[in-house]
Amino acid sequence: MAVTACQGLGFVVSLIGIAGIIAATCMDQWSTQDLYNNPVTAVFNYQGLWRSCVRESSGFTECRGYFTLLGLPAMLQAVRALMIVGIVLGAIGLLVSIFALKCIRIGSMEDSAKANMTLTSGIMFIVSGLCAIAGVSVFANMLVTNFWMSTANMYTGMGGMVQTVQTRYTFGAALFVGWVAGGLTLIGGVMMCIACRGLAPEETNYKAVSYHASGHSVAYKPGGFKASTGFGSNTKNKKIYDGGARTEDEVQSYPSKHDYV
């Protein structure tokens, strides 16, 4: 039961995280005009990964896309790439994890396959989350650098009579959405990886406890160990008895008696 819960929760957390990464990537408020030096501005500037916007005194907001690829800063391109990679990996991870969910039955898919898919999606979510966090952090670092550069310019370039206020930019809402979303995706991925350990058919005989009740019908073979012991050389859980006893896979197909692992 705990495995299913962990896997399901990991999936939901990752889903929310990836939705957040997509939202952050599409948002226009990656950087917003710093109003500290000019709190009375009637023209408010903010920028995203794909376009920059200006909200004017009429309440009208005009946005213009960056219609150039080569003319954009390399850092911005890198952030775009990281966010897109994060979204793509996350989307693939979601697709894989849907089929890996223990509560969803697809044909006669073995638990080992589900475990592998859970691990794969978990790793994808972790990388996706890291990409988003990295992308947002790179952009934030870029903002901090530019902020202090423009602050320096503001106080050194004031030789003339005309007062001009240089626009400085600070962290926009998208950065916080991106950090939180990346973190959630990362956590979801870790949860999926943890769930994978519980799903994987372990190479111990703890499942043999299911044979306690059928002790009377067990036929012993020379040199064999009693199936109910769970110890000894039978590490592969091979069938060492006759008389209607079931294989590991057959046992596993029954209602989840061992979900507590």
Partner: antibody, heavy 115, light 113 residues
Framework: QVQLQQSGPQLVRPGASVKISCKAS????????MHWVKQRPGQGLEWIGL????????RLNQKFKDKATLTVDKSSSTAYMRLSSPTSEDSAVYYC????????WGQGTLVTVSS | DIQMIQSPSSLTVTAGEKVTMSCKSS????????????LTWYQQKPGQPPKLLIY???TRESGVPDRFTGSGSGTDFTLTISSVQTEDLAVYYC?????????FGAGTKLEIK
């Protein structure tokens, strides 16, 4: 096209508050902020303040902070300006203006403060 | 507050003449976000509300005759009427649309001989 219809002229006693209305039509009322402008007879234009009809957030010129109160009624697409404790200095034509670049202006409301 | 200084305060010209009026702001009205100057020109005829002529310092509003031209950047702006018509008799105001409180110049009164 943008149309702003203002209430008629008002004669008020000093100290008695007055409320001017401005009904908007021809555009989405909540899209653009509503500005109010004062013009004393034979004088220039003076910006009073603005209100965002979508959330009723206001920004007032400090000079009119204790004088003007801006409100909106979204259901009727109407903006209001209330002038408190008017004096002869408040006798003027008051305009509401909206849309991008204040493209649309009301016809003006003449407020006369007289005892 | 940004001060808007208009000159001259009044002009008397004959129809067909070219007219230039100036507007200076105490601070730059150039927005670095989109490289636009947030200065607007209005025309107010007697007994009427102001009418938008020019925005972004040089962009003519649709329907405004092309004899009206706005120019300038930063703090110095100009409105030019290439060939004055009798219907241009009005007061012309420049407005700071960049910083609160939005401020208007005192106006330039255009009179026709």
């Amino acid at each position: 096209q943008v149309q702003l219809q203002q209430s008629g002229p008002q004669l008020v006693r000093p100290g008695a508050s007055v409320k001017i209305s401005c009904k908007a039509s021809g555009y989405s009322f909540t899209t653009y902020w509503m500005h109010w402008v004062k013009q004393r007879p034979g004088q220039g234009l003076e910006w009073i303040g603005l209100i965002d009809p979508s959330d009723s957030e206001t920004r007032l010129n400090q000079k009119f902070k204790d004088k003007a109160t801006l409100t909106v009624d979204k259901s009727s697409s109407t903006a209001y300006m209330r002038l408190s404790s008017p004096t002869s200095e408040d006798s003027a034509v008051y305009y509401c203006a909206s849309n991008r670049w204040l493209l649309g202006w009301g016809q003006g409301t003449l407020v006369t403060v007289s005892s | 507050d940004i001060q808007m200084i208009q000159s001259p305060s009044s002009l008397t010209v004959t129809a067909g003449e070219k007219v230039t009026m100036s507007c200076k702001s105490s601070q730059s009205l150039l927005n670095s976000g989109n490289q636009k100057n947030y200065l607007t020109w209005y025309q107010q005829k007697p007994g009427q509300p102001p009418k938008l002529l020019i925005y972004w310092a040089s962009t003519r509003e649709s329907g405004v005759p092309d004899r009206f031209t706005g120019s300038g950047s930063g703090t110095d702006f100009t409105l030019t009427i290439s060939s004055v018509q009798t219907e241009d008799l009005a007061v012309y105001y420049c407005q700071n649309d960049y910083s609160y409180p939005l401020t208007f110049g005192a106006g330039t009164k255009l009179e026709i001989k």
